[in-house]
């Protein structure tokens, strides 16, 4: 059987969802002594980068620039090592946003609701579009579908402090292609007292693992040829 | 925190033998990086004399033929630059320095070489 | 071997000015380029890598860009601690070659 290199881990530097004409940025990470990276996109050649000394990093990145509905699709990449090609990676979905319309999102019964009611957000938009998504600030990749004509709802069932935070739709075109996103929407979860004084309100930070971690090579690392990783897949 | 150090002899006759070592502390010298001679002639003009690499695979500046060696010994954590033929073109300050970017790379102080007749 | 072609050779600047550097290589290194500063009686130090791509510690003020054969080096307001020697370095092709420097005096 043919010898292959373990498989790279393919992500997307601070987001998936590129707003259109601005630049995506992919980073694959591979092992350190790759002398060649290959970026695939809808399974054919689209980039290769070399690192050269004294670079020596654990991969590259790929810049993507003036971003569009042609260049949304599924990445994945591959490295070499001398001779030896690595498997292919888990495949990347990258959206792009901020195409024809922006959607209106409402939620009922309103934004402040207490612990235990029920809760649905309706996302509208008037152009033609059947599937809309919901995402919470910093949960983007737990995206929730819902289908209609001009208008979606997404029941949220009965809500906990836990769903505290602020919300955005988009109408999808495609898969790959999005509208603008509504205004968001804060939803404030009020408890009893005493859940409320321990509840945080959910960070807006950006998803942690969205970022580009290429780093120096160290002799431990060098044993550790890739960090364990358990592959996410945003559309599957 | 990795330091550098160059030791040899501050004057070599020319025809004879140049060699030099680098001292590497905190760091070990196999773990990666790209360890590197680099000289500055008088008036600052600096020249990439070549490297020894984590690995041990050799890059050496075409300019010094087949004059240069550098060698390591991994038990001492310690490379050597040796430069053969030496004339008074090879007058310098010769420096050992890690590079390996994105990291912050690390150099020795120096150590100034005189070739004379 | 790549020729890299530095300029100015020397400046004087004023506090907070900006001041810009430029290094042009006799072909095109692909963004394989380096930006050292060696301040008197020191160590050369790398301050960006590919061109543009700031090292760990470096501070903000410095930045690099350019693509091809022609690259430069800005400090967006000059410090006085920024006096010294500037060099570029290309890497795309052995052997490594530095440009001739710039001098950086305030005035």
């Known amino acids: 059987p043919k010898q292959t290199l373990p498989k790279p881990i393919i992500r997307a530097e601070s987001t998936y969802m590129v707003p259109k004409e601005k630049q995506a940025t992919l980073c694959c990470q591979g092992s350190y002594g790759a002398v060649e990276y290959q970026l695939h996109f809808e399974g054919s050649l689209f980039a290769v980068e070399r690192p050269k000394p004294p670079e020596r990093i654990n991969g590259v990145k790929f810049h993507i620039p003036d971003m569009n509905s042609r260049k949304a699709g599924r990445y994945s990449c591959i490295y070499r090592v001398g001779e030896l090609w690595s498997e292919r990676s888990d495949l990347l979905d990258l959206v792009v946003t901020e195409m024809y319309d922006t959607p209106t999102l409402s939620v009922h019964p309103g934004p402040e609701v207490t612990s235990g009611e029920k809760v649905t957000f309706y996302c509208r938009l008037d152009t033609a579009t059947s599937m809309f998504l919901l995402l919470k600030e910093g949960r983007s990749r737990d995206v929730q579908r819902s289908y209609g004509k001009v208008q979606a709802e997404f029941p949220m069932g009965p809500v906990t402090t836990a769903h505290r935070g602020s919300y955005r739709c988009f109408g999808s075109y495609n898969n790959y292609a999005w509208s603008f996103p509504s205004e968001p929407v804060k939803l404030l979860v009020t408890g009893d007292i005493e859940n409320t004084s321990l509840a945080p309100t959910d960070p807006t930070f950006p998803d942690s693992w969205d970022t580009c971690l290429l780093t120096r090579e160290t002799g431990l690392q060098k044993d550790l040829a890739l960090w364990d990783h358990t592959a996410q897949n945003l559309l599957r | 925190d990795v330091q550098l150090q160059e030791s040899g002899p501050g004057l070599v006759k020319t025809s004879q033998s140049l060699s030099l070592t680098c001292s590497v502390t905190g760091y070990s010298i196999t773990s990666d990086d790209y360890w590197n001679w680099i000289r500055q002639f008088p008036g600052n003009k600096l020249e990439w004399v070549g490297y020894i690499s984590y690995d041990g695979s050799n890059n050496y500046n075409p300019s010094l033929k087949n004059r240069i060696s550098i060698t390591r010994d991994t038990s001492k954590n310690q490379f050597f630059l040796k430069l053969n033929s030496v004339t008074t073109e090879d007058t310098a300050t010769y420096y050992c320095?890690?590079?390996?970017?994105?990291?912050?790379?690390?150099w020795g102080q120096g150590t100034s070489v005189t070739v004379s007749s | 071997d790549i020729k890299m072609t530095q300029s100015p050779s020397s400046m004087y600047a004023s506090l907070g000015e900006r001041v810009t550097i430029t290094c042009k290589a006799s072909q095109d290194i692909n963004s394989y380029l380096s930006w050292f500063q060696q301040k008197p009686g020191k160590s050369p130090k790398t301050l960006i890598y590919r061109a543009n791509r700031l090292v760990d510690g470096v501070p903000s003020r410095f930045s690099g860009s350019g693509s091809g054969q022609d690259y430069s080096l800005t400090i967006s307001s000059l410090e006085f601690e920024d006096l010294g020697i500037y060099y570029c370095l290309q890497y795309d092709e052995f052997p490594w070659t530095f440009g001739g420097g710039t001098k950086l005096e305030i005035k």
């Open positions: 320095a890690r590079l390996g970017y994105p990291a912050m790379d690390s």
